[in-house]
Interface confidence: medium
Amino acid sequence: PRSIDVKYIGVKSAYVSYDVQKRTIYLNITNTLNITNNNYYSVEVENITAQVQFAKTVIGKARLNNITHIGPLDMKQIDYTVPTVIAEEMSYMYDFCTLISIKVHNIVLMMQVTVTTTYFGHSEQISQERYQYVDCGRNTTYQLGQSEYLNVLQPQQ
């Protein structure tokens, strides 16, 4: 097993707001990661960079710096939030997300995350990609793993 394991657990919550005039959707998506240090020494989680894609278009980016340190044979669960905007050429989604006649307005988003860990100045980067369902029609809190979208495109663990 690699010395640092990063596991994308899933979407924890998605908070939605709209701009009616611009036909724009704002989604604040909080994700959960498990980072396991299989080494016999501590490592620093220097930064987490994340982006969210919808229909192959990047709709949001985030970066967290100087996050935490993880002791030997230890694991930390880290939440990070990516603010996303669905607008302009994707404003057609506004109608779907605000449609009252349907209860759940799930869209499929691709979550990409890169974790940079350091030890004595040496950096290691680990990336993950996951497809997730997110409801763009209401504020939602998910049980971990509940939002997972399984299809043939999804890279295996």
Epitope: N38, Y40, Y41, P72, D74, Y119, F120
Partner: antibody, heavy 120, light 112 residues
Framework: QVQLQQSGAELIRPGTSVKVSCKAS????????IEWVKKRPGQGLEWIGV????????NYNEKFKGKATLTADKSSSTAYMQLSSLTSEDSAVYFC?????????????WGQGTTVTVSS | DIVVTQTPLSLPVSFGDQVSISCRSS???????????LSWYLHKPGQSPQLLIY???NRFSGVPDRFSGSGSGTDFTLKISTIKPEDLGMYYC?????????FGGGTKLEIK
Amino acid sequence: QVQLQQSGAELIRPGTSVKVSCKASGYAFTNYLIEWVKKRPGQGLEWIGVINPGSGITNYNEKFKGKATLTADKSSSTAYMQLSSLTSEDSAVYFCARSDFITTVVADYWGQGTTVTVSS
Amino acid sequence: DIVVTQTPLSLPVSFGDQVSISCRSSQSLTNYYGNTYLSWYLHKPGQSPQLLIYGISNRFSGVPDRFSGSGSGTDFTLKISTIKPEDLGMYYCLQGTHQPRTFGGGTKLEIK
């Protein structure tokens, strides 16, 4: 002062299992790793595996995967090693020891050892 | 797994002697970051092993200064400057750099 108190000697039938305990005192249990080591008569020390009691994450010597299972109970500051499907080859003295997170001093304090005898 | 070879297997001594025990690993014990986790232990019959030296050359608390460690990379040495009766027993080196940790086969320090 730092102490690791192990459970008493065990006489076990072949094919059964045994759980050896290692109770820590005199230090912060979750700030140190717990190592397990095997010593058979006439043979050298053999490293079995290590557990971080805070996270429960383990790392095993390949030879002992499936044989030894390491666990820890934070509330009682006790580490455990379960040995399964016992044979005469498992008759040995088993030691626990602690290792420092920060300085990576490996196995600085040891338990007194638990003798496991497998016999029908 | 890392193979750790200790020599000699047996070391007959007289009290007052100076002796050296060698420990050689199948690959470097210095990790990417320049740290080397090599320890020495003394194990006497009926007792628990006791840590003598860690990190190649650091004496553990309470260990007499007649014990010293040296080496780098793959070759390490434990020196005992003046053998005393309480020094008799089995000596082991342990590499803690790589997973899994591995002990050397041991060196028996016994009276001639």
